[in-house]
């Protein structure tokens, strides 16, 4: 009689995480008695999934009865597959005995868990940036499985060329996590811009997942100021006003200064918001010409964001009213702590 | 005090790389930008670029793309500039300056870093 | 690129006088203008920022004015000190350009 074979069809079995795999066995006689055993891995360090006689496993079931007496199927269905079941697994049977010893070997199925990447995550740098800066978004995502992998990056709806991408472990996993750089340019008009990341894997059918970052969160755009004299008001009232255009974010400070002292100080609340998502504001004071003697440098100070502050100045010409006269002149304190700030 | 340490000065080979060191005492590095200023006397102060090591954002003149890399390193406040593919018209001298982030002027200026490209 | 023009490349002036140095953007910088001072064999100092406003330690002499394309530079009552090479620059674009050069002696 021809000699026991044992018989594994699959070469390699491919399954989505979550899933059951079913590994088919079969052997080609009854002879010689003894029970079949499951393992992963070959050698010393093989781990036993499933074994006929005796123990516990209960992610394991067998697809036929394997208790009769005549049964040549020991195919095995395993439940719930993480990328940690990975692996080639090798049905042995095993000839009676004190103890029972191996007689023969299946060639091994490949099992290969297939597994969704998770939701990519884009994170940006650590402080705002200004426009024409160009800076840094990563993403990431993990726990997927084959390692082939797309990622592509778009700003909006245009798609990014500069970006480095690295996927880990380098060598055979269970399973594999992306990571990617991408630089990219601010402009003036980003505010209501997005930066996406996105990645493609045969676990998505055809759908990738998205990340997305907010270019709102990173960057900041500095404002103009105006600074203009409104006609007279009263006999001896000037209207000065200082616009403040295009500026992002909303947090802004402002100090009017006659001759260099502290007129008032307001906070931006009631702003416009621009289309491009940066705010303009206006603010006005009403200067009593007929308290001042000589002429007097209006000053427009601003302080947007935390930032130095930068201002403003208009030159009102108390001989010369009620026209409208003087010069814009502009100023800007850096705010180094050796600076005198207003 | 606030001041600005450049490396001392490079005499290279046409075709060889130059990295120049600027290192930041007496304020907080990522708070500033650090920009790059070439001087010669065909030209006069030319803007190579700026890295802002908060951020690490960057932005660069593209007259020096491709041939000077930016770099900062936080934890030695430091910030580099590499010239790379060197000829005669690198020869000059070139100075780290801060600046606050967007929009502010240059108000310290290191010593400058004297680079001389000769065969 | 935004140009920077300082109309003349170099000036005399007697002790005392008043001078006015032009620098003038190829378009508009809102006000981000920077005055620097160098002189020979020194890195540039910072005068004036924001086109008005005088970096501490300048000396009231010295003042800046302008908006919109055009700005000056002026030093009143000159110094045997002040002569130096005066850069103008603009930061409001990048690259950030600087003008030529206004090179000051003394007759």
């Known amino acids: 009689e021809e000699e026991l074979q044992v018989i594994q069809p699959d070469k390699s079995v491919s399954v989505a995480a979550g899933e059951s795999a079913i590994l088919h066995c079969t052997v080609t006689s009854l002879i010689p008695v003894g029970p079949i055993q499951w393992f992963r891995g070959a050698g010393p360090a093989r781990e036993l999934i499933y074994n006929q006689k005796e123990g516990h496993f209960p992610r394991v079931t067998t697809v036929s009865e394997s208790t009769k007496r005549e049964n040549m199927d020991f195919s095995i269905s395993i439940s719930n597959i993480t990328p940690a079941d990975a692996g080639t697994y090798y049905c042995v049977k095993f000839r009676k005995g004190s103890p029972d010893t191996e007689f023969k070997s299946g060639a091994g199925t490949e099992l290969s868990v297939r597994a969704k990447p998770s939701a990519p995550v884009v994170s940006g740098p650590a402080a705002r940036a200004t426009p024409q800066h160009t800076v840094s978004f990563t993403c990431e995502s993990h726990g997927f499985s084959p390692r082939d992998i797309t990622l592509k990056w778009f700003k909006n709806g245009n798609e990014l060329s500069d970006f480095q991408t690295n996927v880990d472990p380098v060598g055979e996993s269970v399973s594999y996590s992306i990571h990617s750089t991408a630089k990219v340019v601010l402009t003036r008009e980003d505010v209501h811009s997005q930066v996406i990341c996105e990645v493609a894997h045969v676990t998505l059918q055809g759908d990738p997942l998205r990340g997305t970052a907010n270019l709102s969160e990173t960057i900041r755009v500095p404002p103009t100021l105006e600074v203009t004299q409104q006609p007279v008001r009263a006999e001896n009232q000037v209207n000065v006003t200082c616009q403040v255009r295009k500026f992002y974010p909303q947090r802004l400070q402002l100090t009017w200064l006659e001759n260099g002292n502290v007129s008032r100080t307001e906070t931006a609340s009631t702003v416009t918001e621009n289309k491009d998502g940066t705010y303009n504001w206006m603010s006005w004071l009403l200067v009593n010409v007929s308290a001042h003697r000589d002429d007097v440098k209006l000053t427009c100070q601003v302080e947007h964001d935390g930032q130095p502050a930068v201002s403003k100045s208009h030159d009102l010409k108390v001989s010369a009213h009620p026209k409208e006269q003087g010069s814009n002149t502009a100023a800007e304190n850096t705010g180094s702590n050796e600076r005198n700030i207003y | 005090e606030v001041q600005l340490q450049e490396s001392g000065a490079e005499l290279v080979r046409p075709g060889a790389s130059v990295k120049l060191s600027c290192k930041a005492l007496g304020y907080t590095f990522t708070d500033y930008e650090i920009h790059w200023v070439k001087e010669t006397p065909v030209y006069g102060l030319e803007w190579i670029g700026d890295?802002?090591?908060?951020?690490?954002?960057?932005a660069n003149n593209q007259k020096f793309k491709g041939k000077a890399t930016l770099t900062a390193d936080k934890s030695s406040n430091t910030a580099y500039m590499e010239l790379s593919s060197l000829t005669s018209e690198d020869s000059a001298v070139y100075y780290c300056?801060?600046?606050?982030?967007?929009?502010?002027?240059?108000?310290?200026w290191g010593q400058g870093t004297s680079v001389t490209v000769s065969s | 690129d935004i140009q920077m023009t300082q109309s003349s490349s170099s000036f005399s002036g007697s002790l005392g006088d008043r001078l006015t140095i032009n620098c003038k953007a190829s378009?508009?910088?809102?006000?981000?203008v920077a005055w620097y001072q160098q002189k020979p064999g020194n890195a540039p100092r910072l005068l004036i920022s924001?086109?008005?406003s005088l970096e501490t330690g300048v000396l009231s002499r010295f003042s800046g004015s302008g908006s919109g394309k055009d700005y000056t530079l002026s030093i009143n009552g000159l110094q045997a000190e002040d002569v130096a090479t005066y850069y103008c620059?603009?930061?409001?674009?990048?690259?950030?350009?600087f003008g030529g050069g206004t090179k000051l002696e003394i007759k």
């Open positions: 378009e508009d910088i809102y006000d981000r």
């Open positions: 300056t801060r600046a606050v982030s967007g929009y502010y002027a240059m108000d310290y």
């Open positions: 890295i802002h090591p908060g951020s690490g954002g960057t």
């Open positions: 924001g086109t008005a």
């Open positions: 620059q603009q930061y409001w674009t990048t690259p950030w350009t």
